[in-house]
Structure formats: structure tokens, C-alpha cells
Interface confidence: low
């Protein structure tokens, strides 16, 4: 059977539905792909990614991913489907409103990731969920 | 159903010039970084150049900058490469592939079917 | 740059054997390592990606498996279609570099 939050429309593609019955839209996220990224022991730091992309599918979230290893930072940003691990984790928080960072294992490296459900949220990150977003010591993310 | 088909190799002299199309379908191209891979005859692959989604960056492998330039063509669904001042050791079969951002979906995939340059006099 | 190195360079093996390829880098890249399969006049097909990802439509008998500086494709079950050469790739910097291959024959 197919779930309530979900119908089948007749061309076979998936209309996707809020809840409620709405039809969900495709949302909007920052979508650079990876850039190195100066964001460093910060609470918070801005993409600074310029391209907002309508994303591709209805279910689609936000997804901004932090690295750092010994050559440099890069911060990703990419819209994703929730239903599917991205860099092999599962998008445990994609419900979210905004983009809390939380660490991940990966051997030889420091990696967070996080994900959110709600337009251009990840062009903030957020390390800290005390954080103040009215905070102006922000770092922002140099282009390569 | 994705296809990237690549056209413009061909033979030229040592210093010559080619530039090389990939013409994409099937998919938005507009959101995925893209790349060039070559194989020289009897070789291994070798990735050669990388451009963003946007066009706004560019990677080229040591042994072709300042001599092959990447380039895309979002409107029109394709991908460039021009080749200047060509070297034999440049002979190869040229493949254009999808991907290559410094992700976790960081790989090459799928893959056009390759077009022949050689580089002879 | 990283180098990926490979080994065998080539082997022969019979429809129906385990083969494996090792894959080894020069340095950590974590798991951010690539399969390829690659068939005479034909263009490079993915298989594996981040290490262990099948990448879709690839048959189960295919894996991929290690973390840091070696790695390796496993064919558990050879079956006639899959005699190729194959390549690793890490993609954890720039270049991405490809191993020298290796080449799958019959026996």
C-alpha cells in the first residue's frame, strides 16, 4: 500500500506530499559543491556558496558537509534525498530547520556533516546548538 | 537515459590545436561538476581536467596547464576541452565523464565513449 | 600526488574463482577510493565507490572493501562477462589518481 504522505500520479513519477496532503515542493539549497573553506573552530560560519539550486526531487534536504585533514577544509553543499546515506551516513536530522554540524567517524580526517529542511538552510552552519546567529564573529568560506 | 558523446579528436601535428565537445543528455547537467579522463594506447587512464557545476573553477592535471583549458556550456548541455600547443605523449582516446567534486560521490560516472587524438607528424 | 599502486598487474583465473586486487596508496585517503571496469575499446564502468559502495546495477559478486592506505576489489564468484582490466582511483585530493591497472584473463 501506498503511505499517505505519498501518492502516485499517472505518468508513474512520485508526487510527493507533505503530511497534511499538501504537495511538497522541491526546496531551495546551496548547491557548490566543495569549496576550501577557512571555517574553523567556529560556532558558526556562512557558505558564502553563491548558486541556490532548486533541488532536483520534492524530497530532496539540504546537506552541508565539513572536512578537515592535514592538507586543508572544504565545506560541501548539495541537496540529497534523505532516503538514500550520503558519504555512507544516513540523514538522521534532515527534518531539521537548520543545519546543526555533528561529527562523523572517518579514518584520517575530521568530518561533519549535517543536514536540514527548510529553504537555503545550509548556508549556515552551525557547531554549536547554543549558538547565536546574531553573533558577527563569523568566519566565511573563501572560494578556491 | 544519460549519454555523453564525444566529438572533435582527430590527428594533428606536434603544436596543433583540438577542441574537443561532449555532448550530455539525460541528465541536469547544470548541477554536476564534470570532467576529462585520457588513456594513451595500451595505457592506464589518466584524469586530466575538472570544471564545477557552475563553471566557476577549474582543475587541469601538471602536464596540460597553460596549454588545455576546460570549459561547459550550460545552455546548451556540453563540455569543452581545448587542446593548444599538442604534444605525441598527448596521443590518447579522450573520455568526458560526469562527476569529479571532492566529495563522498567523488568518482567518475558515467563515462562518454571516447574520441582518438593523435599526435603525430 | 598520490600514488596508487596496484597488484597484481594481471592474472588468470577460471569463471567461477574468488579473485581479488589490491589497491595501495601512497599516503591515508581515508575511504575515498573508486573501482573501475574497463573492457577493450570500450569506456570505464563504475563499480565501487567510497570504498565499499556498489555503485547501482552492479552485481552483488562484486565488493569492495579497506580504509586508509589499502584497499581491495573482490569478485567472489568470476563469471565470463566480468574478464576485464580494473583500475582504483582515490578521490580524496587533487589530482585524482588512478592505479596502473589490473587485467583479468582467462585461464
Known amino acids: 500500500t501506498i503511505p499517505p504522505h505519498v501518492q502516485k500520479s499517472v505518468n508513474n513519477d512520485m508526487i510527493v506530499t507533505d503530511n497534511n496532503g499538501a504537495v511538497k515542493f522541491p526546496q531551495l539549497c546551496k548547491f557548490c559543491d566543495v569549496r576550501f573553506s577557512t571555517c574553523d573552530n567556529q560556532k558558526s560560519c556562512m557558505s558564502n556558496c553563491s548558486i541556490t539550486s532548486i533541488c532536483e526531487k520534492p524530497q530532496e534536504v539540504c546537506v552541508a558537509v565539513w572536512r578537515k585533514n592535514d592538507e586543508n577544509i572544504t565545506l560541501e553543499t548539495v541537496c540529497h534525498d534523505p532516503k538514500l546515506p550520503y558519504h555512507d551516513f544516513i540523514l538522521e536530522d534532515a527534518a531539521s530547520p537548520k543545519c546543526i554540524m555533528k561529527e562523523k567517524k572517518k579514518p584520517g580526517e575530521t568530518f561533519f556533516m549535517c543536514s536540514c529542511s527548510s529553504d537555503e538552510c545550509n548556508d549556515n552552519i552551525i557547531f554549536s546548538e547554543e549558538y547565536n546567529t546574531s553573533n558577527p564573529d563569523l568566519l566565511l568560506v573563501i572560494f578556491q | 537515459q544519460v549519454q555523453l558523446v564525444e566529438s572533435g579528436g582527430g590527428l594533428v601535428q606536434p603544436g596543433g590545436s583540438l577542441r574537443l565537445s561532449c555532448a550530455v543528455s539525460?541528465?541536469?547537467?547544470?548541477?554536476?561538476?564534470m570532467s576529462w579522463v585520457r588513456q594513451a594506447p595500451g595505457k592506464g587512464l589518466e584524469w586530466v581536467s575538472s570544471?564545477?557545476?557552475?563553471?566557476?573553477?577549474?582543475h587541469n592535471t601538471d602536464s596540460v596547464k597553460g596549454r588545455f583549458s576546460i570549459s561547459r556550456d550550460n545552455s546548451k548541455n556540453t563540455l569543452y576541452l581545448q587542446m593548444n600547443s599538442l604534444r605525441a605523449e598527448d596521443t590518447a582516446v579522450y573520455f568526458c565523464?560526469?562527476?569529479?567534486?571532492?566529495?563522498?560521490?567523488?568518482?567518475?560516472?558515467?563515462w562518454g565513449q571516447g574520441t582518438l587524438v593523435t599526435v603525430s607528424s | 600526488d598520490i600514488q596508487m599502486t596496484q597488484s597484481p598487474s594481471s592474472l588468470s583465473a577460471s569463471v567461477g574463482d574468488r579473485v581479488t586486487i589490491t589497491c595501495r596508496a601512497s599516503?591515508?585517503?581515508?575511504?575515498?577510493l573508486n573501482w573501475y571496469q574497463q573492457k577493450p575499446g570500450k569506456a570505464p564502468k563504475l563499480l565501487i565507490y567510497?570504498?565499499?559502495s556498489l555503485q547501482s546495477g552492479v552485481p552483488s559478486r562484486f565488493s569492495g572493501s579497506g580504509s586508509g592506505t589499502d584497499f581491495t576489489l573482490t569478485i567472489s564468484s568470476l563469471q565470463p562477462e566480468d574478464f576485464a582490466t580494473y583500475y582504483c582511483?582515490?578521490?580524496?585530493?587533487?589530482?585524482?589518481?588512478f592505479g596502473q591497472g589490473t587485467k583479468v584473463e582467462i585461464k
Open positions: 565523464a560526469k562527476g569529479l567534486a571532492a566529495s563522498g560521490k567523488n568518482y567518475f560516472d558515467p
Open positions: 539525460g541528465f541536469q547537467f547544470r548541477r554536476y561538476a
Open positions: 570544471i564545477s557545476a557552475s563553471g566557476d573553477r577549474t
Open positions: 599516503q591515508s585517503i581515508s575511504s575515498y
Open positions: 567510497a570504498a565499499s
Open positions: 582511483q582515490q578521490s580524496y585530493s587533487t589530482p585524482p589518481t
